[in-house]
Each structure stands twice: as C-alpha cells, then as structure tokens.
C-alpha cells in the first residue's frame, strides 16, 4: 500500500522536511503533490510526468519544494504555515489513480529563556516570590530546576500559568538556592541562566561563647556573640543594662569580682528591621589557695610500709581530687581514700607506686592542681644478674664480669671467688685468665637503706676445650599446631660455633625452624607430630668439637578423627557385633561409645553378642586427649536384618 513518511515529523522553522514515499506502484504515468488531506487543484504544489520527466508547479508551489523521480517531496526553509497534511496523487499507466496522505508539524526554534522575579529580596516567613520564565512561547513546555535538581514536592511551591510561573510562598532561608527555568518543544530545549534567591532573615537569638559563666579573678574575659542573619547582624553589648560597645566581641582584661553581672548581646538586622538579645550571667570568683601534698613517710620500704598522702589546706565544703601518673585514680585494693577524699593511703607500697601524685581542690569554676609529688620507694636489691652470661672462657683472655641488681638506693656490690672476698665494686676484672681462675663467682648486692642483701653465684670454667654440650628446652611436651619449642645448646661460651642436627641430618630449610642467639637457640614454631625427632647440638671452638646427647621431642597431638573397624554397616541377626575404634593421638586417647546417643562403655572395643534388629542405630565413638584438651568423634550406622532376608550381609563373627 502506498504510504507517506515525514522525515522528521516534528520540523524546526528554517529547517527542511522530506516526504518519503513507500511502496510506489510500477508502471506509472505521473504523480502530483497537494497541500491538505485531499486532491484539490487549487492546492496543487507540483506535478510530475514520468515519460517527459517534466515537473510542473501548481498554485500552492512556493519555490521551496523539490520533487524527486521516486515521488518523494523535499520542502526547504520550513515556515510555521507549512504545518499540516500533504497528499500524493499517483496516476498509473492504466490510468487508475492512487492516493496517500502524510503530515508533519512545524515548531519554532526556542530562544534562551530568562527568569523575572517579582521580589529580589524577600523576607523570611513573610514574603512570597513569583518567578516567571520569559518569553511566553506557544506549544512550549516549561520546567524548573532548583540547585540543578528537579523541583522538590512542597506545599510552599506552586506552579501556574502552564508551569511558566513558579511561586514560593512564605520563603525561608533554606530557599536560598540557584533557580533555573527550561523551555522545551519537540524540536528544541533551552535552559536559562541561574537566578540566586537572596532571602533576608534573622537575626536569630544570638549565642554567646564561650559557654562557661564562672571566671577566676585576674583572668581575661573574652566574649563573642553570633546570630544567624542575612545581611550579617550588627552587634551591641550591654553590662547590667548599660551600653558598652558596638562590636561582635567584648574583651575585658584582668577581671575582678566587680565584673560579675549580666552581659547582654543585641543583634540587629537593618534590612529586616528585627532585633534579638541573649543574656548570660558572669560570676567572677576570688583566687582559692593552691593546694599542696604532705606525706607521712617520705622513704617507704617496698612491701613493708604504707604511705598516707594528704591534700592541704583543709577547706570546708570543698571537693578534693587525686591523680596518679596524670590519670584519675585506678581501682585497686591497695589505694584507699578517706571519707572527705582529702587523704590517699597506699597500703604496702611497691616500686611502681612512685607516682607522680597530684591533688586538686575543686571550686565552682575550676580545679586547682597541686605540684606533683614523687614517692621515693626503697626496694631491693633483687637477685643480681651477672653479665655476660658465658660460663666458659678460654685461657689468656680477660674476664670482665658486671653485676646489676634493681635497687633503690642503688646497691653496693661485692665479689667473692670460691667464697673469698675479692673487691667491693660492681665490675670484676681479671686479665689474662688461666684454668686456675675457674671457680664459683659470687656477686653480693646490698641495700644500705633497707638492710637487705641478695647474692647470685655463677660457675666460671676457664678451659680452651669445651665440655660435652647439653640441650635445654622451654617446653617438654608441646601441643601440635599450637606450641613453639625453643631448644638451647648449653653452655654459653665465647668464640664458639653452635651447630644443630635433626635425626643425624643437618637442619632442613623450613619457615618453622629459626636459629637465633648466635645459632645457640633453635626454635620450632607451630610444632607438628613430624617434629618428634632426635635433636642434637654441637659446639666447636679452636680446639674442640663436641656433640650433645640426642633430645627427642615428645609432641602431643590428636586425637584425629577416629576410624571404626570393621567397615561393615550391615549385619545378620544373631551375629556378634565387635567394633574397634582407633584414633591417632599422643598420648593415647580415652575412648567411649554411645548407641543412639546413650552412653555405653569407656573402652576401645565395643562388643555385643547375638545382635537383633533392636540393635539397629547410630554407633558413635568418642575420643579425648586429656593432654591436648582436644576431642573428636565419628558416627557409624548399623543395620541388623532378620536372618536370611538380605543376601550379602556380614556374618559379623
């Protein structure tokens, strides 16, 4: 069927449109285009005879039309009047006529719109504002944007005049935004420049900062006032009703009790004509005395003495506060406060109780702190440590031993060799030692204040040759996948190489094996049952090479998931049921059985003679390793059939 397609359907003024013909019949004589929905000679635009290829303009021809051999019609430089229907009249060679009608619409190209406003400075909660999108254009749609978002739903927003007018009733400061309008028709869309709504508001009730109203004599008073307002507010200060100054800040240095009173800030908006005030009452206090701490014991002895710290002076109706190490008091049974909090007692002082301690007196306004007090706790001496830790030295070297014991006051030291006093120094030095210098070296630490003494004895062997080493371990029964084990090769000696073997082989490369302390310590991280091997350490120096006896690591593991044997699950009635449970575990696990959830016996083997179908059910074996604290279990279903009913069943002997 003959049809006309308009490309485009909506045409902008000044552009062109093509009336495209589809399904044009064969064997044509000619065709004519008419303005309108029917063939009307007065409204003929153009005719075309195929045989002569001659185009003849009609009465409605404007000079902007071009006809094509395929009967399509191009209309250029479109005007508004071109809107409407167009009819093609086709005359076939057999002189039979055929008609088709097409149409298009013409729209103007829209200009860039602008916004007009009936009120450039509306007042909050009082005025309305009407924005109008200019110009008024026929067949145009009007849209509005606020801060580049479509209009929010609000009872205070109203569109009218075909959406051309946007009215904001009872404007608020939150309506201060960027407004744009947009005009649209089928051929164009244009957006206006933004218009910023300047809402006049305030002043709100002013806020005075800082908030504190209590001051100490001698301080500076610095008050600041702020009220939300557009345009910004003008500020005035009044003290006890008397005008002071027209500034946002009020500053009074070195205040006295006489500066106590009511301070008023007034905020004024010249555009809205509104005033708001806020009043704060300022109280100036005279300076209280600075507190200080007294102690009943300036040199307490650790674990023996108690100390009472008292906050002075005593003032009626005063709150006393305490701090230790700049923190509030920790909860401790060794710390006691008196009823009025003025006395802090430390029961059985320790070296960690040195402080510093501070007390404070709280008045209406602030807290006055005392100077910090540090306790001189007398302690020690602790057991002395002798360094270095070597026990073997080679002949000819210098022996330099140092002794240290934690002590207050610092300890006085004495050295003894084989029980004979040598010198009263912290360090012992013997040059060019020989085997005759082997012996028991004792360091004695003495605290003259507490009168306590402690000693440490160290065996020193002077020998070019090292003894047979031994291995010490920090964990004799490590748990698999949990514990680490550190083996240490003894003794510790100078200029010594330490070596390690596992099962007679040199150490394997493993991220779980780590050598430290000059290879003297071998650490196995996250031990596994495969680490249960023989470990040997070796020591080598200039004249000796010796190996330790092997130490076998006893790794506790499991229990693994148990296995119930035999694997059969089907039995004949009358057979004996003999189930054995096994789980890899070190030490061997404890076994127990449950049938259908009911505890049975604590044995590795479960035996039931002459079973019947009543013995059907779930058989669970539970294993537990008390050493690892771990448990495991497995469940097996047993089916007992009446004799001879099911082939291939186990006799279950």
């Amino acid at each position: 069927k003959l049809t006309i397609e308009s490309t485009p359907f909506n045409v902008a003024e000044g552009k062109e449109v093509l009336l495209l013909v589809h399904n044009l019949p064969q064997h044509l004589f000619g065709y004519s285009w008419y303005k309108g929905e029917r063939v009307d000679g007065n409204r003929q635009i153009i005719g075309y005879v195929i045989g002569t290829q001659q185009a003849t303009p009609g009465p409605a021809y404007s000079g902007r039309e071009i006809i094509y051999p395929n009967a399509s019609l191009l209309i250029q430089n479109i005007i508004q009047n071109d809107t409407g229907f167009y009819t093609l009249h086709v005359i076939k060679s057999d002189l039979v006529n055929e008609e088709a009608t097409g149409q298009f619409r013409v729209y103007p190209e829209l200009p860039k719109p602008s916004i007009s406003s009936n009120n450039s400075k509306p007042v909050e909660d009082k005025d309305a504002v009407a924005f109008t999108c200019e110009p008024e254009t026929q067949d145009a749609t009007y849209l509005w944007w606020v801060n580049n978002q479509s209009l929010p739903v609000s009872p205070r927003l109203q569109l009218s005049n075909g959406n051309r007018t946007l009215t904001l009733f009872n404007v608020t400061r939150n309506d201060t935004a960027s407004y744009k309008c947009e005009t649209q028709n089928p051929v164009s869309a244009r957006r206006s420049d933004s218009v910023i709504l300047n809402v006049l508001y305030g002043p709100d009730a002013p806020t005075i900062s800082p908030l504190n109203t209590s001051y100490r004599s001698g301080e500076n008073l610095n008050l600041s006032c702020h009220a939300a307002s557009n345009p910004p507010a003008q500020y005035s200060w009044f003290v006890n009703g008397t005008f002071q100054q027209s500034t946002q800040e009020l500053f009074i240095p070195n205040i006295t009790v006489n500066n106590s009173g009511s301070y008023t800030c007034q905020a004024h908006n010249s555009d809205t004509g509104l005033n708001r005030t806020t009043v704060t009452t300022i109280t100036v206090y005279a300076e209280p005395p600075k507190p200080f701490i007294t102690s009943n014991n300036s040199n307490p002895v650790e674990d023996e003495d108690a100390v009472a710290l008292t906050c002075e002076p005593e003032i009626q109706n005063t709150t006393y506060l305490w701090w230790v190490n700049n923190q509030s008091l920790p909860v401790s049974p060794r710390l006691q406060l008196s009823n009025d909090n003025r006395t802090l007692t430390l029961l059985s002082v320790t070296r960690n109780d040195v402080g510093p301690y501070e007390c404070g007196i709280q008045n209406e306004l602030s807290v006055d702190h005392s100077d910090p007090v540090i306790l001189n706790v007398l302690y020690g001496p602790d057991d002395p440590t002798i360094s270095p830790s070597y026990t073997y030295y080679r002949p000819g070297v210098n022996l330099s031993l140092s002794c240290h014991a934690a002590s207050n006051p610092p300890a006085q030291y004495s050295w003894l060799i084989d029980g004979n006093i040598q010198q009263h120094t912290q360090e012992l030095f013997i040059s060019n030692i020989t085997e005759k210098n082997s012996g028991l070296y004792t360091c004695q630490a003495n605290n003259s204040a507490s009168g306590h003494s402690r000693t440490t004895v160290k065996t020193i062997t002077v020998s070019a040759e090292l003894p047979k080493p031994s291995i010490s371990s920090n964990n004799s029964k490590p748990v698999e996948d949990k514990d680490a084990v550190a083996f240490t090769c003894e003794p510790e000696a100078q200029n010594t190489t330490y070596l390690w073997w596992v099962n007679g082989q040199s150490l394997p490369v493993s991220p779980r094996l780590q050598l430290s302390n000059g290879n003297r310590t071998l650490t196995l991280f996250n031990v596994t049952r495969n680490d249960a091997r023989a470990y040997v350490c070796g020591i080598q120096n200039s004249v000796s090479a010796n190996r330790s006896d092997p130490v076998t690591l006893d790794v506790l593991y499991g229990p693994d998931t148990p296995i119930i044997s035999p694997p059969d699950s089907s039995y004949l009635s009358g057979a004996n049921l003999n189930l054995s449970c096994h789980s890899a575990s070190n030490p061997s696990p404890q076994y127990s059985w449950r049938i259908n959830g009911i505890p049975q016996q604590h044995t590795q083997v479960l035996f039931i003679a002459k079973i019947t179908p009543n013995n059907n059910g779930t058989y669970a074996c539970f294993v537990s390793n008390l050493a690892t604290g771990r448990n495991n279990s497995i469940v097996k279903s047993i089916t007992v059939s009446a004799s001879g009913t099911s082939p291939g069943l186990s006799a279950g002997a």
């Epitope: 085997e435 070019a464 040759e465 003894p467 073997w501 200039s542 004249v543 090479a545």
Partner: antibody, heavy 120, light 106 residues
Amino acid sequence: EVQLQQSGPGLVRPSQTLSLTCTASGFNIKDNYMHWVRQPPGRGLEWIGWIDPENGDTEYAPKFRGRVTMLADTSKNQFSLRLSSVTAADTAVYYCHVLIYAGYLAMDYWGQGTLVTVSS
Amino acid sequence: DIQMTQSPSSLSASVGDRVTITCSASSSVTYMHWYQQKPGKAPKLWIYSTSNLASGVPSRFSGSGSGTDYTFTISSLQPEDIATYYCQQRSTYPLTFGQGTKLEIK
C-alpha cells in the same frame, strides 16, 4: 673430600725465616681454626699455634711467641706459617691440622707433613 | 704449661694381649685425647674427649679417666695396632702432648 696440601722449602739456612703454606680443599677455612704442629726427628709432637682465618685472631705457644707469624688468605683458602731466626733446633716435620665437623661427625685432618731441615 | 707424662715410653706385647697406656697431667684437664701415628705418616685422632672413638676406630680400643689421670686400653692387641700413641690435653694453652708410647709386637 677434605684435604690439606702443604708446600714450602725443605731446606732453610740458620737465622733465615722458615715459610710454609697449607692449601685447604673440601671445606672453607674461614669457618674453622687452623693449627700448626711440628715433630722433631725421632721425638714427640709439639703444638705451635692456631689462626682464625675469619678475623686473623691467633694463639701461639709461648715457646714460639716473638718469632712466629700465622697468616690466612681466605680468597685462596690457604694459610701459612712463618718462623723467623731459625736454628738447627727447628729442624722438624711441620704439619698443618684442622678439627672440623664433617656432617654429623667431628673429624681431625692433617697435612702430609713437610720435613724442614735447618742447615748451612 | 701443663706437663703430660705418658707411661710406658715403649712396650712390647703379643697379639691378643690387653695393653694399657697411662697419661698423667700436671694439672686437672677437662678431657684427654689420644692420637695414633705410624712411621712416616701424620698423626690420626684415635680417641677424643677421653672415651669417644674416632670414626673408623675398632671397638677394641677404649679410653677412660678424669682430672689428671687417664688410661688408653687395647683389649686384644692386633698386628695393625703397632704404632706410637700420644695423649694430648686441650684444656689450656699451650696445647701439650705426651712424649709418646711406642707399641711393638713380641
């Protein structure tokens, strides 16, 4: 295979310096202490001293101090003995010697020995 | 210096005999070590740290002792055991050897 190969002159003039070198193979001298021992003809063994090639530390028998020097060249894996102002009493077979861990076992290795005769 | 006194300085024994050599130190030592030396050869470590047999040493050899007095024993003398045996202390410098015990077959 661990080996100690000695080299040096078999004849040294009195008052001159005896100089012997020991080249090690099969192990790194830097990891061990290297000793020198001598044995005068028909007599017993006499320890001269050791050197730690890693840092050059030495320990000499008092009898030889003042005229003995031990040196090591770790890049060549060799060490040497120098004994100055020799006399006929220094005529002996000189051995280089090391005590090392060969795998799991502590092993004792000796050079083949060099007979040094002090004579004019 | 620690003096090492070995005795006897030589001894003659028959194949299968039990042979004992003693070594006395002038001061206490940690361990005693024993070397075997055959004519024209370098010494070989035979027993280390008083009682440990060096690699390849037959079990008929043994060592014992402590402090200043140590013993070297062959439970059943064999022809291949003919050599000079030296004791050595390594406890203090200088390291010192005994004067040696020459072992011969009768």
